[in-house]
């Protein structure tokens, strides 16, 4: 004979557990129904009556099958440096992620708690490592034969144009200027070794120390002016 299907609430067999989407109520000592996502337990079960569920109120949610007495509050509205990538509904929390040009300096379980602007490399410096959703840009000095004339969080150092006749030689922050004969971008004759970064340590402010274990949030604090990170701008 097929086993009889038990309807909630029911007393479980000794040593057995309640079924999927059921929970064991310690007070009633019965297996009772959980509430579906978007709902919460309005009235807990008894020996004779099952759980009574109710919909979550506005700005609250439950994401899982549950028996919580109150729905969880959705997170606060996204800040100006964030975009809402998932709205608050009865079944899911709001998720805020950093808007373009920013990265997540302090993450939370879903989305981002604190966004920070991506570092911008100033002229003479290029992006050694691009910023990602969770990491900042790394700036390094342009090597001889390369240049960057922009203040940018995306631009790398690019090769100087190779001139038949050079009007103005290029440097770390300026491309070479050729005379009217057409320039090329091919390799310079005899240029067989690697480009070397210009050692410009003495020409720039010392880098602002940044802890390696946690993101810097000094731009949020009411502090006096400090020098920008080397090769970067604070804006």
């Amino acid at each position: 004979l097929p086993a009889q299907v038990a309807f909630t609430p029911y007393a479980p067999e000794p040593g057995s557990t309640c079924r999927l989407r059921e929970y064991y109520d310690q007070t009633a000592q019965m297996c009772c129904s959980k509430c579906s996502p978007g709902q919460h337990a309005k009235v807990f079960c008894t020996k004779t009556s099952d759980t009574v569920c109710d919909s979550c109120e506005d700005s609250t949610y439950t994401q899982l099958w549950n028996w919580v007495p109150e729905c969880l509050s959705c997170g606060s509205r996204c800040s100006s440096d964030q975009v809402e990538t998932q709205a608050c509904t009865r079944e899911q929390n709001r998720i805020c992620t950093c808007r373009p040009g920013w990265y997540c300096a302090l993450s939370k379980q879903e989305g981002c708690r604190l966004c920070a602007p991506l570092r911008k490399c100033r002229p003479g410096f290029g992006v050694a490592r691009p910023g990602t959703e969770t990491s900042d840009v790394v700036c390094k000095p342009c090597a001889p034969g390369t240049f960057s004339n922009t203040t940018s969080s995306t631009d790398i150092c690019r090769p100087h144009q190779i001139c038949n006749v050079v009007a103005i030689p290029g440097n770390a922050s300026m491309d070479a200027v050729c005379t009217s004969t057409s320039p090329t971008r091919s390799m310079a004759p005899g240029a067989v070794h690697l480009p070397q970064p210009v050692s410009t340590r003495s020409q720039h402010t010392q880098p602002t120390p940044e802890p390696s274990t946690a993101p810097s949030t000094s731009f949020l604090l009411p502090m006096g002016p400090s020098p920008p990170a080397e090769g970067s701008t604070g804006d």
Epitope: G126, A128, P130, T132, K140, E210
Partner: antibody, heavy 118, light 107 residues
């Protein structure tokens, strides 16, 4: 011309720790990010992590994160990669690579063979 | 993780001919792709960075193209010294990942 010279081959027992050095010469180590890349025998390249010697900030690949430590000594222009809890599958050539403002790994060390065997 | 898939695994071409190597990313990586050459017993060396910029000292016969998810390395007139393994690499997001390599061999 920038040059990266790595320490010599190592033979280690399972469970041991290896520390490889990478000496940067020709230019200051702080002008670069230093990456470490693993290449197992007959296999492809696998990124392990990098260090920015300027501020000692590091970034690790998740596969290696719990076992690798990358450090740099700016006074000697040397970067180090330490890999702990070695197992046989860690037998590989390990490369350091310098990353300049072109955004690429433009100079590589000669590689260090690490053999893990009981 | 972003998966970089190179094809073919092995390419047999005669010297003087053109070789075209493909690299596909599992998601959009913009132009954040580099190409490296590795010869037996040697370290890799960069050929192309940012998908299409030829590195200092690299001969003009090497060119790179593509953006988004599809990238190509072309060697216009193969020289004997070009027979090697070629890897593509993406640096759009962490972890940085490499393709499995294409072995370019003499036909």
């Amino acid at each position: 011309e920038v040059q990266l010279v790595q320490s010599g081959a190592e033979v280690k027992k399972p469970g041991a720790t290896v520390k490889i050095s990478c000496k940067v010469s020709g230019y200051s180590i702080t002008d670069y990010l230093l990456h470490w890349v693993q290449q197992a025998p007959g296999k492809g390249l696998e990124w392990m992590g990098w260090i920015d010697p300027e501020d000692a900030k590091t970034k690790y690949g998740q596969k290696f994160q719990s076992r690798v430590t990358i450090t740099a000594d700016t006074s000697t222009d040397t970067a180090y990669m330490e890999l702990s809890s070695l197992r046989s599958e860690d037998t590989a050539v390990y490369y350091c690579a310098a990353n300049s403002a072109t955004g690429t790994m433009d100079a590589w060390g000669q590689g260090t063979l690490v053999t893990v065997s009981s | 993780d972003i998966v970089m898939t190179q094809s073919p695994a092995t390419l047999s071409v005669s010297p003087g001919e053109r070789a075209t190597l493909s690299c596909k990313a599992s998601q959009n990586v913009g132009s954040n792709v580099d190409w490296y050459q590795q010869k037996p017993g040697q370290s890799p060396r960069v050929l192309i960075y940012k998908a299409s910029i030829r590195y200092t000292g690299i001969p003009a016969r090497f060119s790179g193209s593509g953006s988004g998810t599809e990238f190509t390395l072309t060697i216009s007139i193969l020289q004997s010294e070009d027979f090697a393994v070629y890897f593509c690499m993406q640096s759009k997001s962490y972890p940085i990942t490499f393709g499995q390599g294409t072995k370019l061999e003499i036909k």
